[in-house]
Interface confidence: low
């Protein structure tokens, strides 16, 4: 069972939010869908096949940033009915290609700041147990991806974390993995890929909303980042 990275996005009534999603590869349909209560299916909200769900027309935009391996979905004129569970994804099958779960909460008043809210203790960067150790669910490989930085990156194969010559195509804003080669042995953590844009964002410390100049209100943080499949984000 693949456990999706999960992020929480909060916005104010009438405001807007930007949802950041991993862009696994070029030339594939990408989408944001909304999970339907009861049915368990995920209905497309917006996709690159020019589909926009009726109730989002005129207030949703999808922008691709292929060099950053990232796509953004902005939803404006937020209403309380926009609150719910969404998912980013890639591929022709909306239900099967999900790469990230997004919980959107639209509220009428915005709390002052992250700092003024009681927050659970955030894990320390150096003390997360799976940073430099083999987790129980990891493969037997003892190599970590060693990434080099060619000026231009061609399309490369998907991530297969069982190989010591892992290739990574994903490079969202937060994670600058680009192409190739596993030439030096190191402790290997195969549980995540560089595609975890939103699972990484806000991972270690909550953000203040002011950083996002695209939206009036935007907070996005990781809820779960410990059990992700090495092939997530591949669609």
């Amino acid at each position: 069972l693949r456990i999706l990275p999960e992020v929480k996005v909060e916005g104010e009534l009438g405001g807007s939010v930007t949802i950041k999603c991993p862009l696994p590869e070029m030339h594939v349909r990408i989408y944001l869908c909304r999970e339907m209560a009861g049915s368990g299916t995920c209905g497309t909200v917006v996709s690159t096949t020019n589909f926009i769900k009726a109730e989002y027309k005129g207030r949703v935009t999808l922008k691709q940033y292929p060099r950053k391996n990232l796509f953004l979905v902005e939803v404006t004129q937020l209403t309380e009915s926009d609150s719910g569970v969404y998912a980013c994804g890639a591929g022709m099958n909306t239900d099967r290609g999900k790469t990230q779960k997004v919980t959107l909460n639209v509220h009428s008043e915005y709390e002052p700041s992250w700092e003024e809210q009681p927050m659970p203790e955030t894990p320390k960067w150096f003390h997360l147990p799976y940073l430099f150790q083999m987790p129980a669910y990891a493969s037997s490989s003892k190599f970590v991806t060693r990434v080099t930085t060619p000026a231009q990156r061609g399309k490369v194969p998907p991530v297969h974390h069982s190989s010591p010559t892992t290739q990574i195509t994903h490079r969202p804003r937060v994670s600058r993995a680009s192409s190739v080669a596993g030439d030096k042995p190191r402790t290997f953590l195969p549980s995540t890929t560089a595609s975890k844009i939103s699972a990484l964002e806000g991972l270690l410390k909550p953000q203040t909303p002011s950083y996002n100049h695209h939206t009036r209100l935007h907070r996005q943080r990781a809820l779960d980042y410990g059990s992700q499949s090495g092939r997530e984000g591949q669609g």
Epitope: V147, F188, L203, Q207
Partner: antibody, heavy 124, light 105 residues
Framework: QVQLQQSGAEVRKPGSSVNVSCKAS????????ISWVRQAPGQGLEWMGR????????TYAQKFQDRATITADISTSTVYMDLSSLTSEDTAVYYC?????????????????WGQGIMVTVSS | ILSQAPLSLSASIGDSVTITCRAS??????LNWYQQKPGKAPKLLIY???SLQSGVPSRFIGSGSGTDFTLTISSLQPEDFATYYC?????????FGQGTKLEIQ
């Protein structure tokens, strides 16, 4: 607030290696990644590589991909950068910096906290 | 590749100066500006092309998007005389401009 404390000056002979360190203190929970940037005397800044912990991936500038190795020691909250096959052109000040592209400073995507720098001299 | 201009600049206290940074290809707004004084580590001034880093005086103004960016310092103060670098974080391999040395006239 995070502080990055770097090790002392180093002198090495051509062909040898140097290992420089960068110890994080303070609010290490706000560190998303650490980059290494160097500056030769009278020259500009040159990014060498970075380590980001989740997932544990090291990324290197092409120029350094065969000679640089960045590692981290969780027990001491220290990041290391090893540079091998040194030549006189590697004489420089080596800085570590918080690579502010995740965690609390996602939007910045910049180096906002720097170590004080380590002077590495390569001379025969 | 980032190209800064001018590479050297003389000005007087109270002047307004502009430093430009041109990217060989679009870097969107992933462009940062740093100030460095002799013997010191660089200091982040502007991130994301135009956002002022916390604690930096408002006389530092960044603008631009795509390939052309500017750093303007209005009403120069004595402590502003330093070297300024632009840096892009759009591509995997971060790069810096050559630097602009701002000297007192």
């Amino acid at each position: 607030q995070v502080q990055l404390q770097q090790s002392g000056a180093e002198v090495r002979k051509p062909g040898s290696s140097v290992n420089v360190s960068c110890k994080a203190s303070g609010d290490t929970s706000s560190i998303y990644a650490i980059s290494w940037v160097r500056q030769a005397p009278g020259q500009g800044l040159e990014w060498m590589g970075r380590i980001n912990p989740i997932p544990r991936i090291t990324t290197y500038a092409q120029k350094f991909q065969d000679r640089a190795t960045i590692t981290a020691d969780i027990s001491t909250s220290t990041v290391y950068m090893d540079l091998s096959s040194l030549t006189s052109e590697d004489t420089a000040v080596y800085y570590c910096a918080r690579d502010c592209s995740g965690g609390s400073c996602f939007r910045q995507d910049a180096f906002d906290i720097w170590g004080q720098g380590i002077m590495v001299t390569v001379s025969s | 590749i980032l190209s800064q201009a001018p590479l050297s600049l003389s000005a007087s206290i109270g002047d307004s100066v502009t430093i430009t940074c041109r990217a060989s290809q679009s870097v969107s707004d992933y462009l940062n500006w740093y100030q460095q004084k002799p013997g010191k580590a660089p200091k982040l001034l502007i991130y994301a092309a135009s956002s002022l880093q916390s604690g930096v005086p408002s006389r530092f103004i960044g603008s631009g998007s795509g390939t052309d960016f500017t750093l303007t310092i209005s009403s120069l103060q004595p402590e502003d005389f330093a070297t300024y670098y632009c840096q892009q974080s759009y591509t995997t391999a971060y790069t810096f401009g050559q630097g602009t040395k701002l000297e007192i006239q």
